[in-house]
Every structure is written in structure tokens, then in C-alpha cells.
Amino acid sequence: APTSSSTKKTQLQLEHLLLDLQMILNGINNYKNPKLTRMLTFKFYMPKKATELKHLQCLEEELKPLEEVLNLAQSKNFHLRPRDLISNINVIVLELKGSETTFMCEYADETATIVEFLNRWITFCQSIISTLT
């Protein structure tokens, strides 16, 4: 059974992941630029199911495309540095799901915009944090 300290660590990591995803979404929502329209044309794969930490494999597999889309947004008004941000998220995801995981991600048939994608993973973090609180 997980110890209270490991639960606390998991909760903190999930909170960090949640904040990073919220920061990206806030940056995009604040973004007044023709590039935003282009960003919304990129399609992301959504998990068929995302209820456990192992399902973060699906997020990990989409981090490279996410970085590529965020690179489009670089300007003086977009304060997220994609390489640092994605690297940080990647570290958290690996720690949360475990690097030994052999879980194969199953994706939904429908793809999503970056906003829908971020909202899905934000909801995932929030629901798991709620069960740990």
C-alpha cells in the first residue's frame, strides 16, 4: 500500500503537472495572434481512457507534437519556453507513471485541438488530485 509520504509526493507532482498545463492553456487563451488560428489546426490524439497514472503514457506520447505547436507561438507576449516546459512536464510524467511501464496507450478515434487536449489532461489531473486530497 502507498505510504502517506508517497501519496503526498504523487499529489505534489500532479499539482505541478496541473499547473504547467494550466499555464499553457492560459498562455494560449491570452494569445492574440494570427498564429493561434494555425495552432488550432494541429490535431492531438486523445486517450480512449484516462483514469489512472499509467494512462499518462498517452500524454507522454503527445509531448513532442505539443512542443512543436508551442514553438509556433513564440513571441514577446508568450512567456512559456517550450523546450523547458515540455522537459519539465516529461520529467513529472515519467515519475508519475513510472519509467518501467509497459502500458500501451489506446487512443480515441476522434482527434482534438490543443485546447481540447489540454482541457482533457487538466481534468485528468484534477480528478486524481481530488481522490488523493
Partner: antibody
Framework: QVQLVQSGAEVKKPGASVKVSCKAS????????MHWVRQAPGQGLEWMGI????????SYALKFQGRVTMTRDTSTSTVYMELSSLRSEDTAVYYC??????WGQGTLVTVSS | DIQMTQSPSSLSASVGDRVTITCRAS??????LAWYQQKPGKAPKLLIY???SLDEGVPSRFSGSGSGTDFTLTISSLQPEDFATYYC?????????FGQGTKVEIK
């Protein structure tokens, strides 16, 4: 103990910039993201933005975008909030808060000609 | 942005009274709600997080309830040190937003 200590009160002229510091102690600096919140005299609380203290990236409220810059110095466990093009409406107490349960004492910034 | 509306904006009560403050979100925020107490010239103090969890060291006379859009902060028996302004806050989505505050005054 865990605490955030902010720099002292500032008086600035309209159009100038102000840089407020917030020094963390008693915990691992990179463990909690830092928010900045301000409160104008007799008014409520207003979120300005957030900084990830480990990687240094930020996200700001739309109202402050283009005027606010949040930075950090991991060697001194300090975060900074700089607000430019000051106007009288920016007169407020500025707070840093780590994880929402630990707050700095606040820094009064007065903008007056 | 999610709007947070508190009511009442002020209230007068006596020591020993039961006090209830409500907060309504403009959209569902699940239980991503916190309550703060602020005294003049001081920083806000976290009382309740996750809608109903009491922060460390906060007296048990404070309690929070609700989920979705409607939330309540209750002080079961008002003490002299409880006269202050109380704020609700959502952290469900950025930008983080606060209610306009409820000032609890001595009757």
C-alpha cells in the same frame, strides 16, 4: 520556519517601473510554484500570474500581459515581480504566495506624481 | 474567466453567533475552491482548501462545504478574533479569481 519575505514599500512616478522581491526560506524553493496577487486600497484580491521557480517560465493574467515580468534567482531562493508603465491604479499592496498557504507580508507600491 | 460572487458583502454578528457566507462560481469548479481570512494590514490566511478541507492550525469552528458552483463557509460560533474579511477563490482554471469579499463586523 517556512516564510516569504518581501522587499520594502516603494513610491514611483507614473510611467516608471517597480521591481518587488520575495525571498523564500524554510523549504525547498523549487518545490512550490509562486503566485503574485495584488490588492488596491480597500479593494479585493487580484491574481497577477505565476512562475515555475525551477524552470523559470511564467504565465500572466491577461490584464497585466505586456507590463509584468516575473523572474527568479534559484541561488538566492528569490522571485521578482516587475511591473512597468505604472499608473495611479497600480497603487496597491503586492503579495507573493507559495502554494497559497504561505504568503509574503506584502509590499505597498504607491504611484503618484 | 470564472466569476466568483460572494454574499453578503458585509454582515454584523455577535460573539457566539453562527455565521454563513456563500460563494457562487459562474461555472462548475468541482471542489477547486479555497477560503481566506484577511485582517487589516495583513496578508490573507488560508482557512479551507478543496472546498471542505481545513488547513493546518485552523480552528474547527470553521467549515466549508459545496461543490460545482455553490459553496459555503460556516463559522459555528463566532469568536472575537474572527472579525475580518473573508474571500473565496477558485483555482480550477487560470486566471485564478477571487470573490469580492465579505466583511464580518461586530454588531
Amino acid at each position: 520556519q517556512v516564510q516569504l519575505v518581501q522587499s520594502g514599500a516603494e513610491v514611483k512616478k507614473p510611467g516608471a517601473s517597480v521591481k518587488v522581491s520575495c525571498k523564500a526560506s524554510g523549504y525547498t524553493f523549487t518545490r512550490y510554484y509562486m503566485h503574485w496577487v495584488r490588492q488596491a486600497p480597500g479593494q479585493g484580491l487580484e491574481w497577477m500570474g505565476i512562475i515555475n521557480p525551477r524552470a523559470g517560465y511564467t504565465s500572466y493574467a491577461l490584464k497585466f500581459q505586456g507590463r509584468v515580468t516575473m523572474t527568479r534567482d534559484t541561488s538566492t531562493s528569490t522571485v521578482y515581480m516587475e511591473l512597468s508603465s505604472l499608473r495611479s491604479e497600480d497603487t496597491a499592496v503586492y503579495y507573493c504566495t507559495s502554494g497559497w498557504d504561505v504568503w509574503g507580508q506584502g509590499t505597498l507600491v504607491t504611484v503618484s506624481s | 474567466d470564472i466569476q466568483m460572487t460572494q454574499s453578503p458583502s458585509s454582515l454584523s454578528a455577535s460573539v457566539g453567533d453562527r455565521v454563513t457566507i456563500t460563494c457562487r462560481a459562474s461555472q462548475s469548479i468541482s471542489t477547486w475552491l479555497a477560503w481566506y481570512q484577511q485582517k487589516p494590514g495583513k496578508a490573507p490566511k488560508l482557512l479551507i482548501y478543496a472546498a471542505s478541507s481545513l488547513d493546518e492550525g485552523v480552528p474547527s469552528r470553521f467549515s466549508g462545504s459545496g461543490s460545482g458552483t455553490d459553496f459555503t463557509l460556516t463559522i459555528s460560533s463566532l469568536q472575537p478574533e474572527d472579525f475580518a474579511t473573508y474571500y473565496c477563490q477558485q483555482s480550477y482554471s487560470f486566471p485564478v479569481t477571487f470573490g469580492q469579499g465579505t466583511k464580518v463586523e461586530i454588531k
